[in-house]
Interface confidence: low
C-alpha cells in the first residue's frame, strides 16, 4: 500500500534550489530500484517533478495560494521488468499554505456619499468594504479592520463594518459642503505587521432649510410714471437664502403699507427675485408716494429648525409716482348735436370743451379727425371748439353724422384725445309728396255714378314731427267738366269715384287725371301724380273682358279696384 | 415707407388728352385723399383737386373743372387726373400729394410728372 | 373760395440774415395752414403745420405765427441751404389754395 500524508506547501517560496514538496512511497519498495515512481495530474511534469526511483517530489516554480489552492495528483508505483503495477493509482493533494502576502483591498477605488448637514451624530453616511485574498480560514492573513485616516473629527468608522458615520454636531452645509474622507483597511486584525490598503470618501453635505430669506437692504426705492398700466414692473427686490434649491425657493407678498391695494409683488421663479408691479391705475394728482412692507419667507420650512427664527424677512419699498403729461379730458365721453338740415354753410351746430388734467393746464386745440369725415362736411375753431357745417346737409340722404373730435395739447401735440360726436340732422320739410306707386286702374263701361275704382296712397321723404297729413285734389285744370271726382279720405289716402253713369270706351279708352298731393308742413310741399283710367268692357260682376289693347300692358295696374 | 410713384414725363401734341399715373405704396390706398397740383416753369403752386380713394368723391378748383378729371383704380393702388383738350398753357410738372389725416397738411409728395404739349 | 396773398413774390438776402415772409387769408381759416419749401426741380417740403408747429426735422430757425388771417414764416440767421422758394397753403373749407410764392435768392 501507498504511505504518504496529506502533502502541504508553502507558496511564494523563494529559495534557489527547486522546493521540495515530499516522497511517494510504496511498501513494496526494496530499495534495489525495480520500481519506477510515475506522477500524473495538476501540474505534474511542469510545476511537480518526480524522481522516478526514490519517488521525491519536488515544485519547480513559485505557487501562488491565491492563484491555486489546491493541486490533486495521481501516483503509481511500476515494476520496471514487468512494467505493471505494484500499486492501485491513487489520487492524492497537494495543498498550498497560505502566506500574509495579500493587502486588503477596497471594492472601489473612490466611494462618493451624501448626507444631510445639521444631522445627529452617528448618523449613517456609507459602509466601505474591502477584501483580502489571503486565506481566511488559517491565521489572521484576512483578517480586516476599518480606520479613519483623515477626516477626523468630522467622521468616524466602525472598526469591523465599515460603517462611516457622522462623529461631530451641527455640521453646516453652508459653512462647508465637501470632504474627503481616507479609510484604511488592515489585516492581520490591525496587529503590527499586517498589510494595509485605502480607499478615498467624498462626502457632501446635502441641504436642508436651516437659513431664512434675508433681504441684503431694509428700503427699496423705486419711480414709476402714473400712466403705468396695471401689470407694469417698476421694480425688482431681492432677498437672499443661504439654502439651495427649493430650500432656497423664496415667496414675496406685500403685508402692509398704504400701497397695499395700489401694487402687488410676483415672484419671478426663475431669478427668485420679487417683482413689484401696478395694480390699480395712479394718479400723480392725488398721490404722490407709497411705502409698502414686503415680506420673503420660504414656502417650504422644517419644523425641527424653527427654533432658529422665523423663516422670513421683511423690507420697506417706497413708490414715488412720477408726474406725466396726460392727454386732455373732454367734458363728455361724448356730444350729441343736432342741426337742421336746412342749415347754411357755417352754421354753428355747438361745441366742445377739453383741458389739459395736468398741474400745467397746457392750452389745447381742436381738429376733426378725417377718417371719420372724409368728405369734410364739418368743421372745428382749433381755439374754441365750435363745430359748424362746411357743406349742406340733407337729412334724407344721411341722418346721423358720427365724426371724431381731436383735442391736442399745444405745447405737446403727442398728447391728444379723442371724443365721439353724434350729429343728428333734424327734418325740414323739403320734399313734396307722392304717390306711393304708379297708379293705372280701369272702369268698366256700365259703371254707375260714385263707384270707387281706385284708392291712392302717397310717401313723403320728410318725418315731421306730427306725422304726415297729405291732402288729395283734382289738378284745377282738371276740375271742371272731369267725368271722375277725387275723394280725400283724411287718413293720408284718396278714392277716385266715377261722376258719371256709363263710359263709352269707343269714344274714349283712357282718361288721365292729374292729381295733386299737399302735405300739411311749413313750407307746404305738393306734386302732381298722374293716375291712367282705361274704360274696359266688363261682364255683370264688374270683371273686366275687353280693354283697349294698350291696357294689357300693366295687368297689375288693371286687377286694382275691380 | 409711403411712396407716390410718377412718371417722369409726358410729351402730347396739342389738342390731345393724356392720362396721368400716381400709384400709391405703404399705406392703405382708401384712407387717404389724393391731391392734384400744378406747377408751370417758373411759376408757383396751383392747386388742381382731390379725390377720395374709398368712394370717388372729388372737389376741384373751378379753373380746372373742365380740364381734369380724377379717378382711381383701388385694385392697383392708383390715382390717375386726365387732362383734356391740351395747350401750351397745360405745360407743367404735375404733382400728386396725400394729406396728412389730422393736421391735413401735404406730407408726402410724388416726384411730379413733367408734361410738355409741343406739336 | 378763400385767396391767399404771399409777400413779398422776391427778396435777396444774405447768409445771416433774418427774414419773415406773410400770408394773408380772404377770410379767417383757423389757423389752419402750412409753409413748405422748394428748391429748383424738386417736390415742395413741409416746414411748418398748424401756423405754428415745425414738421419732424425741420432746423429751430424756422418758425411760424399768426392766426384768423394773418400768417407769417421767419428765418432766423439764414444758411446757404435756405434759399428757394417758399409757399404757403390753406386747408380751411373744402377747396385749397397756395399762396403765389417768395423766391429767396442770395445777394
Known amino acids: 500500500s501507498w504511505m504518504w500524508n496529506q502533502f502541504f506547501l508553502l507558496e511564494e517560496y523563494t529559495g534557489s534550489d527547486y522546493q521540495y514538496v515530499g516522497k511517494l512511497h510504496s511498501d513494496q519498495d526494496r530499495g534495489d530500484g525495480s520500481l519506477k515512481y510515475i506522477l500524473s495530474g495538476d501540474g505534474a511534469g511542469d510545476l511537480f517533478i518526480i524522481n522516478e526511483n526514490t519517488g521525491d517530489i519536488q515544485a519547480t516554480k513559485r505557487l501562488d495560494r491565491e492563484e491555486k489552492p489546491v493541486y490533486i495528483l495521481r501516483a503509481q508505483a511500476i515494476n520496471r521488468r514487468t512494467g505493471r503495477p505494484v500499486e492501485p493509482e491513487s489520487e492524492f493533494i497537494i495543498k498550498i499554505h497560505d502566506i500574509n502576502d495579500n493587502e486588503p483591498i477596497f471594492t472601489k477605488e473612490v466611494y462618493t456619499a451624501t448626507v444631510p448637514e445639521m444631522s445627529d451624530v452617528g448618523t449613517f453616511v456609507v459602509q466601505v468594504t474591502a477584501t483580502d485574498a489571503d486565506d481566511p480560514t488559517y491565521g489572521n492573513s484576512a483578517k480586516v479592520v476599518y480606520s479613519i485616516l483623515q477626516g477626523q473629527p468630522y467622521f468616524s468608522v466602525e472598526s469591523e463594518t465599515g460603517i462611516i458615520k457622522t462623529a461631530l454636531l451641527n455640521m453646516d452645509r453652508e459653512n462647508r459642503e465637501q470632504y474627503q474622507v481616507v479609510i484604511q483597511a488592515k489585516d492581520m486584525g490591525g496587529q503590527m505587521g499586517g498589510l494595509s490598503g485605502t480607499t478615498t470618501v467624498n462626502i457632501t453635505l446635502t441641504d436642508v432649510n436651516d437659513n431664512p430669506p434675508r433681504f441684503p437692504q431694509s428700503t427699496y426705492q423705486f419711480k414709476t410714471p402714473e400712466s403705468s398700466p396695471p401689470g407694469t414692473p417698476i421694480g425688482r427686490i431681492k432677498a437672499s437664502d443661504a439654502d439651495v434649491g427649493e430650500n432656497a425657493e423664496i415667496e414675496y407678498s406685500i403685508t402692509d403699507g398704504e400701497g397695499l391695494d395700489m401694487f402687488d409683488v410676483i415672484t419671478d421663479q426663475e431669478t427668485q427675485e420679487g417683482i413689484i408691479t401696478v395694480k390699480k391705475l395712479l394718479d400723480f394728482e392725488k398721490k404722490k408716494v407709497y411705502t409698502l412692507k414686503v415680506e420673503a419667507s420660504n414656502p417650504y420650512v422644517e419644523p425641527r429648525f424653527l427654533y432658529l427664527g422665523p423663516f422670513k424677512d421683511s423690507a420697506t419699498v417706497r413708490i414715488v409716482v412720477e408726474d406725466v403729461d396726460e392727454p386732455p379730458v373732454f367734458s363728455k365721453l361724448a356730444y350729441i348735436l343736432q342741426i337742421r338740415e336746412d342749415a347754411q354753410i357755417n352754421t354753428t351746430i355747438g361745441s366742445v370743451t377739453a383741458q389739459d388734467p395736468d398741474a400745467a393746464r397746457n392750452p389745447v386745440k381742436y381738429s376733426v379727425d378725417r377718417h371719420t369725415d372724409m368728405d369734410r362736411i364739418f368743421n372745428i375753431d382749433s381755439g374754441n371748439g365750435s363745430i359748424f357745417t362746411s357743406k349742406l346737409l340733407d337729412r334724407e340722404t344721411l341722418l346721423w353724422h358720427n365724426i371724431t373730435v381731436i383735442a391736442t395739447e399745444i405745447n405737446n401735440p403727442k398728447q391728444s384725445s379723442r371724443v365721439p360726436l353724434y350729429i343728428k340732422v333734424l327734418d325740414v320739410n323739403d320734399n313734396a309728396p307722392e304717390f306711393a306707386e304708379f297708379y293705372e286702374t280701369f272702369v268698366c263701361e256700365k259703371a254707375k255714378a260714385d263707384q270707387l275704382i281706385q284708392t291712392l296712397h302717397a310717401v313723403d321723404k320728410d318725418d315731421p314731427y306730427s306725422g304726415h297729413q297729405f291732402s288729395f285734389s283734382l289738378a284745377p285744370e282738371a276740375a271742371s267738366g272731369s267725368n271722375f271726382t277725387i275723394q280725400d279720405n283724411k287718413d293720408n289716402t284718396a278714392g277716385i269715384l266715377t261722376r258719371k253713369n256709363g263710359y263709352n270706351r269707343h269714344e274714349m279708352s283712357t282718361y288721365l287725371l292729374p292729381v295733386v298731393i299737399s302735405d300739411n308742413d311749413y313750407p307746404v310741399q305738393s306734386s302732381t301724380g298722374t293716375v291712367t283710367v282705361r274704360v274696359c268692357a266688363c261682364d255683370h260682376h264688374g270683371n273686366m273682358q275687353s280693354c283697349h289693347a294698350e291696357a294689357l300692358i300693366h295687368p297689375t295696374g288693371l286687377s286694382t279696384g275691380a | 415707407q409711403v411712396q407716390l410713384q410718377q412718371p417722369g414725363a409726358e410729351l402730347v401734341k396739342p389738342g390731345a388728352s393724356v392720362k396721368l399715373s400716381c400709384k400709391a405704396s405703404?399705406?392703405?390706398?382708401?384712407?387717404?385723399?389724393i391731391h392734384w397740383v400744378k406747377q408751370r416753369p417758373g411759376q408757383g403752386l396751383e392747386w388742381i383737386g382731390e379725390?377720395?380713394?374709398?368712394?370717388?368723391?372729388?372737389n376741384c378748383n373751378e379753373n380746372f373743372k373742365s380740364k381734369a378729371t380724377l379717378t382711381v383704380d383701388k385694385s392697383s393702388s392708383t390715382a390717375y387726373m386726365q387732362l383734356s383738350s391740351l395747350t401750351s398753357e397745360d405745360s407743367a410738372v404735375y404733382y400728386c400729394?396725400?394729406?396728412?389725416?389730422?393736421?391735413?397738411?401735404?406730407?408726402?409728395w410724388g416726384a411730379g410728372t413733367t408734361v410738355t404739349v409741343s406739336s | 373760395d378763400i385767396q391767399m396773398t404771399q409777400s413779398p413774390a422776391s427778396l435777396s438776402v444774405s447768409v445771416g440774415e433774418t427774414v419773415t415772409i406773410t400770408c394773408r387769408a380772404s377770410?379767417?381759416?383757423?389757423?389752419?395752414l402750412a409753409w413748405y419749401q422748394q428748391k429748383q426741380g424738386k417736390s415742395p417740403q413741409l416746414l411748418v403745420y398748424?401756423?405754428?408747429n415745425l414738421a419732424d426735422g425741420v432746423p429751430s430757425r424756422f418758425s411760424g405765427s399768426g392766426s384768423g388771417t394773418q400768417y407769417s414764416l421767419k428765418i432766423n440767421s439764414l444758411q446757404s441751404e435756405d434759399f428757394g422758394s417758399y409757399y404757403c397753403?390753406?386747408?380751411?373749407?373744402?377747396?385749397?389754395?397756395f399762396g403765389g410764392g417768395t423766391k429767396l435768392e442770395i445777394k
Open positions: 400729394t396725400i394729406p396728412n389725416l389730422l393736421w391735413w397738411y401735404f406730407d408726402v
Open positions: 398748424e401756423a405754428t
Open positions: 397753403q390753406h386747408f380751411w373749407g373744402t377747396l385749397w389754395t
Open positions: 379725390i377720395n380713394p374709398s368712394n370717388g368723391v372729388t
Open positions: 377770410e379767417n381759416i383757423y389757423s389752419n
Open positions: 405703404g399705406y392703405t390706398f382708401t384712407s387717404y385723399w
